[in-house]
């Protein structure tokens, strides 16, 4: 006799208003008496509709939460698994049931903001900027909301960057415990003349950090050929172990690049009689602290003061 199990009931994808952090939830299947004491597991697959691959989760719970790109629709499917100790070792699963979440198509795509860019300056404050939609009326203005796990609800930006009395960006500081988790942003708009399409963005703050440039550069030459360059990590909350550096060294008319995770570097002079020996450096968050990052501006150039040429007597 073939063993069968029903799919979960009332599978749905719910939006609690957290700008892309959605709830996928369901109820247990109707289970025949024989399997009442069995452990049920649920295999959940979900994706944004334009994605080739499904994300798969196995859970014994009745809810799963994850972040999505709300610029696109979402689809999910779920089925029940019976543990093999209830089925004499055979794998028993129900048919799939499906659910979807459609995005709002209010407002044409041309009304949506363009070129959204966000930078987390020195791991201290976030600046996001955007351009108005391609075709919008002059009364259009935009509003930015954000949410990350730890906030009770989505918050509106309190410090807008403005151009011609229109919001074109936002500055956020005091973002407590907001890194290493998804940070959700929605920029929506209003106009008396037409609806405006909302724009959604999600990223993790540690991956968009732009540090301050290194400071207190120093260069010295020992034994007339060994160059030693050192610099200080910039001030602020980024731990020294989180930096990687790119250095440009200039010896007369020749310059070359080097890289290190330390805040000093040693190398040999290319020519003993070189008259000009300078370097400058920039930094970014390294792979041990983030998956990505933005290079700082270059530091001021520092040159070796120790050279004494034939005309210096």
């Amino acid at each position: 006799l073939e063993i069968k199990v029903n799919p979960p009931q009332d599978f749905e994808i719910l939006d609690p208003g957290l700008l892309g952090y959605l709830y996928l939830q369901w109820k247990p299947p109707v289970v025949i008496e024989k399997f009442k004491g069995c452990t049920l597991e649920y295999e959940l697959k979900y994706r944004n509709v334009d994605s080739d691959s499904w994300k798969t989760i196995i859970t014994r719970n009745l809810i799963y939460k994850d972040g999505f790109d709300l610029n696109k629709g979402i689809e999910g499917k779920i089925r029940t698994h019976l543990s093999e100790h209830c089925t004499n070792g055979s794998e028993v699963q129900s048919p799939w049931i499906e659910a979807s979440y459609g995005i709002s198509d209010e407002g044409s795509l041309e009304t949506k903001i363009q070129d959204m860019k966000c930078i987390y300056y020195n791991w201290q404050y976030l600046v996001c900027s955007w351009k108005p939609g391609k075709t919008v009326y002059s009364d259009t203005n935009y509003t930015m909301f954000f949410w990350y796990e730890g906030l009770d609800h989505a918050l509106q930006c309190a410090d807008y960057l403005q151009h011609d009395e229109k919001n074109v960006g936002c500055k956020l500081s005091n973002l407590d415990s907001s890194d290493y988790k998804d940070f959700f942003i929605c920029v929506n708009g209003s106009s008396k003349l037409e609806p405006i399409r909302s724009s959604y963005t999600v990223f993790q703050l540690q991956n968009i950090v732009k540090p301050l440039p290194p400071e207190f550069l120093h260069i010295s030459v020992e034994n007339s050929i060994d160059i030693r360059m050192k610099w200080s990590t910039p001030g602020g909350p980024i731990p020294p172990r989180c930096y990687t550096y790119e250095i440009v060294i200039r010896e007369d008319d020749i310059s070359w690049e080097s890289a290190t995770d330390k805040n000093d570097m040693k190398l040999k002079r290319r020519a003993n009689e070189s008259e000009d020996l300078c370097f400058f450096v920039r930094c970014k968050v390294n792979i041990y602290c983030a998956d990505d990052g933005i290079w700082s501006e270059w530091s001021e150039e520092e040159c070796w003061e120790g050279y004494t040429g034939p005309d210096s007597k």
Epitope: I57, T59, R60, S83
Partner: antibody
Framework: EVQLLESGGGLVQPGGSLRLSCAAS????????MTWVRQAPGKGLEWVSA????????YYADSVKGRFTISRDNSKNTLYLQMNSLRAEDTAVYYC??????WGAGAFDYWGQGTLVTVSS | DIQMTQSPSTLSASVGDRVTITCRAS??????LAWYQQKPGKAPKLLIY???SLESGVPSRFSGSGSGTEFTLTISSLQPDDFATYYC??????????FGQGTKVEIK
């Protein structure tokens, strides 16, 4: 008596490959899900990968996804872990583990003795 | 991912003491939690599954309790053989299966 015996560990250079095997005995191998768990020197336990009883579904930790492949041969009572593009941070003792009950994972009731994988140049 | 946090990281105790180790999940995991004991150079050993079920062959001085997000492993009277590192593990939702960072029980 349930026994899980891992083999295939050793020293490998970064970027290299290794295939771990786990010979199982003392239970009906095709029934339970099986997993690999690793432990870096002096560190805690890290789940690596799981495979269902039939071998039809596999699951991976993000840290190894795309580099490691779990498989099983139920006719030979053997579990495998193919490890490619190895990195220094993959250095660990790798344990072959039987799942007590559950589709792809659950409580782990039997563990092998472990095999050491060292990734170093 | 579900994070598992154990406390304390290290626990100093004497033979005969009652010892309690806590494990906290970042979200509800019902009763889908296991406890393991590991001695240096050895593989972990299952003590408790489904939060409170004692694995066959494990001494009854070990017990587990809790549900949702808060769990405890209790050793009612610590024996010389119990000095080891203990790990909790959730299997409510995966991938990934996640472990606590471990609690080392050492001799006072």
């Amino acid at each position: 008596e349930v026994q899980l015996l891992e083999s295939g560990g050793g020293l490998v250079q970064p970027g290299g490959s290794l295939r771990l095997s786990c010979a199982a005995s003392g239970f009906t191998f095709r029934r339970p899900a099986m997993t690999w768990v690793r432990q870096a020197p002096g560190k805690g336990l890290e789940w690596v990968s799981a495979i269902t009883g039939s071998g039809g579904s596999t699951y991976y930790a993000d840290s190894v996804k795309g580099r490691f492949t779990i498989s099983r041969d139920n006719s030979k009572n053997t579990l495998y872990l193919q490890m490619n593009s190895l990195r220094a941070e993959d250095t660990a003792v790798y344990y072959c583990v039987k799942v007590r009950y559950g589709w792809g994972a659950g409580a782990f009731d039997y563990w092998g003795q472990g095999t050491l994988v060292t990734v170093s140049s | 991912d579900i994070q598992m946090t154990q406390s304390p990281s290290t626990l100093s105790a004497s033979v005969g003491d009652r010892v309690t180790i806590t494990c906290r999940a970042s979200q509800s995991i019902s009763s889908w939690l296991a406890w393991y004991q590991q001695k240096p150079g050895k593989a972990p050993k299952l003590l408790i599954y489904d939060a409170s079920s004692l694995e066959s062959g494990v001494p009854s001085r070990f017990s587990g309790s809790g549900s949702g997000t808060e769990f405890t492993l209790t050793i009612s009277s610590l024996q010389p053989d119990d000095f080891a590192t203990y790990y909790c593990q959730q299997y409510d939702t995966y991938p990934p299966i996640t472990f606590g960072q471990g609690t080392k029980v050492e001799i006072k």
